[in-house]
């Protein structure tokens, strides 16, 4: 069964920076990644970021980059503006769009344990998975 | 703009084989991925192949896996669909459709539709 | 596969009704759901898709809501050309399922 993997991780160097990282386990071409906040698309979510793999990418503030890290990957830099760290408690989502097969979606969020002083770059951010 | 024609249907024999073809313009053809549909006379709608934008995934439900194959000729702009091992239930008028990947794969631009009659 | 329950099958209405189509999933679809609409002689029209978002050209008295497994799609002040068949359609697993259908007649 196809699987989306959702990983937030929360830049050392800048505590208002950001990254949600998403893959795609399974078979067929993906055909559109659809990244959100809040909640998935259409269901109270925000949409932050849509990737096709061709036609190239659409991105919303806070969203500061997205793009395509493998052929069934992305990543997406986000900029907190505010004083305060929102992004820390949201629910960040993915939905990988593959033809034939359908869509997966998965999110997830910032551990609550991260601290960025003791996360050093090598170190692996656990991988949040729930297919919705 | 958009244009879908379909052709090839027409009266066939219980267990025999038709092929339909789909010629596609105004639009870059390789660049969707595209479908055949069919609508029974009982006015239902059935997905019955399916084939990405560059040809290497298809799909068939149970009902015509084995039995239909489909597949594209981006040369020449057409989609195809080979049906073989004809029963009384693939009597239906046949579309060929287009996928938007933007709208969630809805399908956004319909052929005609061709009809297929297999009679006993 | 997943199974797209329409309801109601025939709707009888007069010119300017508010008419609503209802289409229940048998799993989630996530918000992966088209309406078609199907006029007499002619082959399927896109009118929505992502449940609520209306097709190039398609009125503003047309409209989609729900989530999941539950859509509702509505025609605000029925016209006499929306006489037809509407078809909700879900695009979110293989194989792409259709309601069976609702055909819309105007007294």
């Known amino acids: 069964t196809p699987e989306v993997w959702v990983q937030v991780q929360m830049e050392a160097t800048e505590l208002s920076s950001f990254t949600v990282h998403c893959g795609f386990l399974g078979p067929g071409s993906i055909s559109l990644v659809t990244v959100s906040w809040g909640g998935p698309d259409g269901a109270g979510g925000t949409k932050l970021a849509v990737l096709h793999p061709e036609l190239g990418t659409r991105q919303w503030a806070p969203a500061r980059q997205a793009r395509w890290e493998t052929q069934s990957s992305i990543s997406l830099a986000l900029e907190d503006s505010g004083a305060s760290s929102p992004f820390a408690n949201t629910t960040f989502c993915c939905k990988f769009a593959s033809f034939p097969e359908g869509s997966w979606e998965s999110c997830g969020s910032l551990p609550p344990s991260s601290d960025p002083g003791l996360s050093a770059p090598p170190t692996p951010v656990p991988i949040l998975r729930a297919d919705l | 703009d958009v244009k879908l024609v379909e052709s090839g249907g027409g009266l066939v024999k219980l267990g025999g084989s038709l092929k339909l073809s789909c010629a596609a313009s105004g639009f870059t053809f390789s660049s969707y991925h595209m479908s055949w549909v069919r609508q029974t006379p009982e006015k239902r709608l059935e997905l019955v192949a399916a084939?990405?934008?560059?040809?290497?995934?298809?799909y068939y439900p149970d009902t015509v896996k084995g039995r239909f194959t489909i597949s594209r000729d981006d040369a020449e702009n057409t989609l195809y669909l080979q049906m073989s091992s004809l029963k009384s239930e693939d009597t239906a008028l046949y579309y060929c459709?287009?996928?938007?990947?933007?709208?969630?794969?809805?399908?956004?631009?319909w052929g005609q539709g061709t009809s297929v009659t297999v009679s006993s | 596969s997943i199974v797209m329950t329409q309801t109601p099958k025939f709707l009888l209405v007069s010119a300017g009704d508010r008419v609503t189509i209802t289409c229940k999933a048998s799993?989630?679809?996530?918000?992966?759901v088209a309406w078609y609409q199907e006029k007499p002689g002619q082959s399927p029209k896109l009118l929505m898709y992502?449940?609520?978002h209306r097709f190039t050209g398609v009125p503003d008295r047309f409209t989609g809501s729900g989530y999941g497994t539950d859509f509702t799609f509505t025609i605000n002040t029925v016209q006499a050309e929306d006489l037809a068949v509407y078809f909700c359609h879900q695009a979110y697993r293989s194989p792409w399922t259709f309601g069976g259908g609702t055909k819309l007649e105007i007294k």
């Open positions: 992502y449940v609520s």
């Open positions: 799993q989630s679809v996530s918000n992966d």
């Open positions: 084939i990405s934008r560059d040809g290497d995934s298809t």
């Open positions: 459709s287009r996928h938007e990947d933007y709208f969630g794969f809805a399908m956004d631009s």
